[in-house]
């Protein structure tokens, strides 16, 4: 018996508006009905929780109102979008998936998605 497998892309480049999207896919060993997905960021030997959501299979993913994350789920796949990113937010974003119900509990952690964020250049003043 091994840890539950979680797949996510190795690298994603955020858009000029500071939005990054990636898919987190897990190989469910059972028929989970309640799943918790957490996005963690590891950078400079620090680990922080970016956002988390618990959802019932077949229902929408619901993050807290002030969360920088949104997402949708389809089967064993979660489409995650993180917004409001700036260059200082560049780092390794890790998808953690927990099968909460019914028992048994399972935990899987992806190998991380390196998200690169480049702050846009300010527009030069123009005299028209």
């Amino acid at each position: 018996c091994k840890a539950m497998h979680v797949a996510q892309p190795a690298v994603v480049l955020a858009s000029s508006r500071g939005i990054a999207s990636f898919v987190c896919e897990y190989a469910s060993p059972g028929k989970a009905t309640e799943v918790r997905v957490t996005v963690l960021r590891q950078a400079d030997s620090q680990v922080t929780e970016v956002c988390a959501a618990t959802y019932m299979m077949g229902n929408e993913l619901t993050f807290l109102d002030d969360s920088i994350c949104t997402g949708t789920s389809s089967g064993n796949q979660v489409n995650l979008t993180i917004q409001g990113l700036r260059a200082m937010d560049t780092g390794l974003y890790i998808c953690k998936v927990e099968l909460m119900y019914p028992p048994p509990y399972y935990l899987g952690i992806g190998n991380g998605t390196q998200i690169y964020v480049i702050d846009p250049e300010p527009c030069p003043d123009s005299d028209f």
Partner: nanobody
Framework: EVQLVESGGGLVQPGGSLRLSCAAS????????IGWFRQAPGKGRETVSC??????SYADSVKGRFTISRDNSKNTVYLQMNSLRAEDTAVYYC??????????????????????WTQGTQVTVSS
Amino acid sequence: EVQLVESGGGLVQPGGSLRLSCAASGSTLDPFVIGWFRQAPGKGRETVSCINRSRTSYADSVKGRFTISRDNSKNTVYLQMNSLRAEDTAVYYCAASPDKPFYTDQTMCNKHYYGYWTQGTQVTVSS
């Protein structure tokens, strides 16, 4: 699936020793990092120590006093606690995390990466 059961807590005098055990069933410990964490009354859960196949890591507050080890033949991880102090009083938990290539000595014990939490065992250091 992994199931963890810890044991070995109790009451001990300052300067004394205790050994906690965390036994796994349902899976070999090999692909996991096993961590020990503690929570004192009114405080958050903090890292004590963790171990994978080749590395160990300790919180600064326990370095030189606590030793973590694993016995793969018994599927068990141990936390030997020596020179115990009143501030070591807490509920101690063990938990597991899939071992990942991006874990560093500084992050492999981070509680965010863990699951399979045990119920906890009380350790009280008092005279």
